[in-house]
């Protein structure tokens, strides 16, 4: 009973808090649970008590076991117990499960990684911040104050994200590292009616005859997973299968893209070595979803060779 | 011995607000946490929310979030407890009593308040 | 929020008698659960905290077990002195009382 898990590295400092809550007058007495010997409050010891927390400075494998904190107020004595592990530095890059924090989910609107029990410790910024071992470098990433902001979040952002800062005591610093991992999950999802990105209403395009060319449809219709939502092009009101001419070809499959967050999808039309009744078609790509159709024409144009005298 | 001392009876309309004091003797009000207690007549006991004297930080029951405010003066080692917008169901017994972060050991001997129009 | 649910609300007991009550938490409380006797127009008088530490001065007749989600109160032998209203307090999370459980001269 209020008994609380604490782990720490050999050779970096560790600092406990009495799992009891209590006012910071209250006098804390710290214990060896095994021997019940009492733990020093001078701060020469590398392992010493100084109110509500327990310091090891630094940690060591054999400081591993339980101590107990007696919080006495003035109207009562409250027992907490802290069971401390200390763990031999990993060789590898490798972070073991039993040295991670909490897991912390992140969104695109929300990214934000507390460096855990850094509220314990004398430390100043900035913070160091790791991912898989590699320091985070680029403008994505904002060590702000206790905590790393990553800008326009990813599902590859997920992994382990380890802090590191110093610990101060009395002059002397003190490593500290601290691994939790960071899982991005899908803002909840939505549909809306369809947004053609392009091309423009009523767009025209000014193509080489005898050249190829390329037209793309690209519609956005919600956010995250759409049940329905397609693209595709027609002709003069026709379907392109519908439409006997070969040169011209709706790529298959249609790729789905996220921008901003949003689902949007694009299908490409090929039209090779352009011909002049190709420039009397009416073009039209279609976005379609269970809200409705929207669509929006292009027409080709000759393209006007400019003569320089 | 440790003495909670609080303030007389009151009566007070619908809407109107009440401010009872607890005067405590033979403690520093500093050293502990102050509680408020409310019990409707013939009711139990309901908790309303503790205030750390020594540094102002209060906690409030939902139950009475935004309507009670609890202080204190410690040079005078006075708590005080204001409830506002009275309604009839607030006619109750008022307790103080001080104790740490989890429970009350010693009480004072309680304030009777009506509301009544 | 923690819920307390307190039995029974009335218990009727003749002295000598050995009478339990029970509080039980809709969430696993740690055994932050302490014991309360209030005798009419009286202030509560705290008898036992921490789940069964019992109160200096308390009597030993009184004796507080359990934990997790249920926590009972005894009185081995009920002395005429103990005829009150019992109150559990959980304070895991706030502080919320029970809803009594007037002990009665059967």
């Known amino acids: 009973k209020f008994s609380k898990q604490s782990w720490g590295l050999e050779n970096e400092a560790l600092i406990v808090r009495c799992p009891r809550q209590g006012k910071s007058s209250y006098i804390v007495d710290w214990y060896y649970s095994q021997t019940n010997k009492s733990i020093p409050t001078q701060e020469r010891n590398r392992v010493f008590a100084s109110g509500q927390l327990l310091k090891f400075l630094p940690a060591e494998v054999a400081d591993s076991g339980i101590y107990t904190c007696i919080v006495r107020s003035p109207t009562f004595n409250r027992t907490g117990y802290a069971n401390v592990t200390i763990y031999k530095k990993q060789p590898d890059c490798n972070v073991p499960d039993y040295l991670m924090y909490s897991t912390v989910s992140g969104s695109e609107k929300n990214s934000k990684i507390y460096c855990p029990t850094i509220d314990l410790y004398n430390w100043t910024a900035p913070l160091e911040w790791f991912k898989n071992c590699q320091a985070l470098q680029g403008s994505r990433y904002k060590a702000h104050k206790s905590f790393l902001v990553i800008d326009n979040v990813m599902t590859d952002d997920a992994g382990d994200y380890t802090c590191k800062f110093i610990h101060n005591e009395n002059g002397a610093n003190y490593s500290v590292t601290a691994t939790r991992s960071f899982t991005v999950k899908d803002e909840q999802g939505f549909s809306l009616f369809p947004v053609i990105r392009a091309p423009a209403h009523n767009e025209t395009k000014e193509v080489e005859i005898g050249e190829n060319t390329n037209l793309t449809c690209s519609a956005c219709f919600g956010k995250g997973a759409q049940f329905l939502a397609t693209v595709q092009w027609q002709l003069n009101g026709n379907k392109i299968t519908d439409f006997s001419e070969p040169r011209i070809q709706q790529e298959e499959g249609q790729n789905q893209s996220f921008s901003n967050g949003l689902a949007c999808v694009n299908t490409v039309l090929r039209i090779a070595d352009v011909k002049e009744e190709d420039l009397l078609l009416r073009y039209d790509c279609l976005a379609l979803n269970l809200h409705g159709l929207r669509r929006h024409t292009i027409r080709l144009s000759r393209k006007h060779h400019h003569h320089h005298h | 011995e440790v003495q909670l001392v609080q303030s007389g009876a009151e009566v007070k309309k619908p809407g109107a607000t009440v401010k009872i004091s607890c005067k405590v003797s033979?403690?520093?009000?500093?050293?502990?946490?102050m509680h408020w207690v409310q019990q409707a007549p013939g009711k139990g006991l309901e908790w309303m929310g503790r205030i750390d004297p020594a540094i102002g930080n209060t906690e409030y029951a939902e139950k009475f979030q935004g309507r009670v405010t609890i202080t204190a003066d410690t040079s005078t080692d006075t708590a005080y407890m204001e409830l506002s917008s009275l309604r009839s169901e607030d006619t109750a017994v008022y307790y103080c009593a001080t104790g740490d972060f989890y429970a009350m050991a010693y009480w004072g001997q309680g304030t009777l308040v009506t509301v009544s129009s | 929020d923690i819920q307390m649910t307190q039995s029974p609300s009335t218990l009727s007991a003749s002295v000598g008698d050995r009478v339990t009550i029970t509080c039980i938490t809709n969430?696993?409380?740690?055994?932050?659960i302490h014991w309360y006797q209030q005798k009419p127009g009286k202030a509560p008088k705290l008898l036992i905290y921490?789940?069964?530490t019992l109160r200096p001065g308390v009597p030993s007749r009184f004796s507080g077990s359990g934990s997790g989600t249920e926590f009972t109160l005894t009185i081995s032998s009920l002395q005429p002195d103990d005829f009150a209203t019992y109150y559990c307090?959980?304070?895991?999370?706030?502080?919320?009382f029970g809803q009594g459980t007037k002990l009665e001269i059967k």
């Open positions: 033979a403690f520093n009000i500093k050293d502990d946490y």
């Open positions: 307090l959980q304070s895991d999370n706030m502080l919320t």
């Open positions: 921490e789940g069964n």
């Open positions: 969430t696993d409380i740690d055994d932050v």
